[in-house]
């Protein structure tokens, strides 16, 4: 017998469905209605036929009582080709739910998203994560999606984007967004970062993650942040091949005084890069290629410095910097 596509745990907390049949029995997902955390993977199926079965224009208020009874707080939908109209229909219905975190991964969104009707209510998400989602509408996708969300979004993560730059003039501000993660967009680069960080649309950002995004120098990132008026408290530039030296012709960039934590681990650095902020609470330089202990004048004023996993560090040697958090044990880098 073929295994059931969905599995609900004994606590009714987590439910995972993997639909791999060409014509899946979607009713199997019903058992997930009592779960808090739901994952549905559609095996790469085209969900276009669903449009014939559902009335995407129906008033979602007719489902309000049922949807309010759902316990789902975290929903992941993956591996499907989804008509924009169907996505919108789902968002309209889910607006009546208690859903807080939505993850979309490995999706191809086809067609354009209609505008939000006047009487419609947006989805009150706190977290939206997108990974490898392509949109037929190109650069305007974020603005189109944003209109279906209430303005309280706190966490936005966009990985493996086909169009990581946004149509900034169409995007409204994200007043509550404190964490923006653009990691795993290796083609982004510093110019792309400037295009993605729409000026003054992200006024509340505290945490900015740019792992594996094709960044080249901390100074270049500083310039992009300054241009956008983004002042994070914490910045993650790990897993980028960073150059330690700054282009002499490039203007010097003043880091925001708000920045207190900088992650430069796994960045291939052979020396401490120039142009770092003058003062930091946390600086992570672990798993680089530093062949000697950094001199005090090369480093910012820093409370917690991590240098683990660099070649110069042999277990048992003296800690290279006051206030360091090094364990003396070389981690797996």
């Amino acid at each position: 017998t073929t295994p059931e596509p969905c599995e609900l745990d004994d606590e009714d907390f987590r439910c995972v469905c993997n639909f791999s049949e060409p014509q899946p029995d979607w009713s199997e997902a019903f058992q997930c209605v009592s779960a808090v955390e739901v994952e549905i993977h559609a095996g790469g199926l085209n969900l276009e036929p669903f449009l014939k079965r559902v009335d995407a224009d129906a008033d979602p208020r007719q489902y309000a009582d049922t949807v309010k009874a759902l316990r789902v707080r975290r929903l992941t939908v993956g591996a499907a080709q989804v008509p924009a109209q169907l996505l919108v229909g789902a968002l309209r219905v889910l607006a009546y739910s208690r859903l807080k975190e939505l993850t979309l991964e490995d999706l191809k969104i086809t067609g354009t998203m209609p505008p939000l009707p006047l009487e419609a209510t947006g989805l009150a998400l706190s977290s939206l994560r997108l990974r490898n989602v392509s949109w037929a509408t190109g650069r305007s996708w974020l603005a189109e999606l944003q209109q279906w969300l209430k303005p309280g979004l706190k966490v936005l993560s966009i990985a493996q984007a086909h169009s990581p730059a946004f149509s900034c003039e169409q995007v409204r501000a994200f007043p509550a967004l404190t964490s923006l993660d653009l990691s795993d967009n290796p083609g982004l680069g510093e110019r792309g970062l400037m295009a993605a960080l729409c000026p003054h649309k992200f006024p509340a950002i505290q945490n900015l993650a740019l792992r594996n995004t094709g960044m080249e120098t901390p100074t270049g990132v500083c310039a992009a942040l300054a241009a956008a008026g983004v002042q994070p408290h914490s910045l993650d530039l790990s897993h980028n091949s960073l150059r330690a030296t700054v282009n002499p012709s490039a203007p010097r960039c003043m880091w925001s005084s708000a920045l207190n934590s900088l992650n430069l681990s796994f960045a291939g650095l052979e020396q401490v890069p120039k142009g770092l902020p003058a003062k930091l609470r946390v600086l992570d330089l672990s798993c680089n290629r530093l062949n000697r202990a950094p001199q005090p004048d090369e480093l910012p004023e820093v409370d917690n410095l991590t240098l683990d996993g660099n070649p110069f560090l042999v277990p048992g040697t003296a800690l290279p910097h006051e206030g360091s958090m090094n364990s003396g044990v070389v981690p797996a880098c």
Epitope: E7, D10, V33
Partner: nanobody, 115 residues
Framework: QVQLQESGGGLVQAGGSLRLSCAAS????????MGWYRQPPGKEREMVAQ???????NYGDSVKGRFTISRGNARNTVYLQMNNLKPEDTAVYYC?????????WGQGTQVTVSS
């Protein structure tokens, strides 16, 4: 191991009613989603009705408005009230309990609707 026992099937005239019952016994530590499925002669098994642990229901298109699924007071008992029965409702009706690791199915009860 969980056992499911269906009852209430039988022969009924078109337009008539039947009430199926299903009782679950064995190692069940929480209220689980349950459902009724049917297999008409020579056809695939299909979903008839489902009920979640919190009482949310779902019905197959062909039975909407005629069949009602409900839970009993006992922890994992489920009923299927079938009204306005049609000859095409003739099938073996199975009860199902959604359970982590391996779902449990009953042996089935025959429902025959004569015209």
């Amino acid at each position: 191991q969980v056992q499911l026992q269906e009852s209430g099937g039988g022969l009924v005239q078109a337009g008539g009613s039947l009430r199926l019952s299903c009782a679950a016994s064995g190692r069940i530590f929480s209220i689980r989603p349950m459902g009724w499925y049917r297999q008409p002669p020579g056809k695939e098994r299909e979903m008839v009705a489902q009920i979640s642990s919190s009482g949310i229901t779902n019905y197959g298109d062909s039975v909407k408005g005629r069949f009602t699924i409900s839970r009993g007071n006992a922890r994992n008992t489920v009923y299927l009230q079938m009204n306005n029965l049609k000859p095409e409702d003739t099938a073996v009706y199975y009860c199902r309990l959604f359970k982590t690791g391996a779902d449990s199915w009953g042996q089935g009860t025959q429902v025959t609707v004569s015209s």
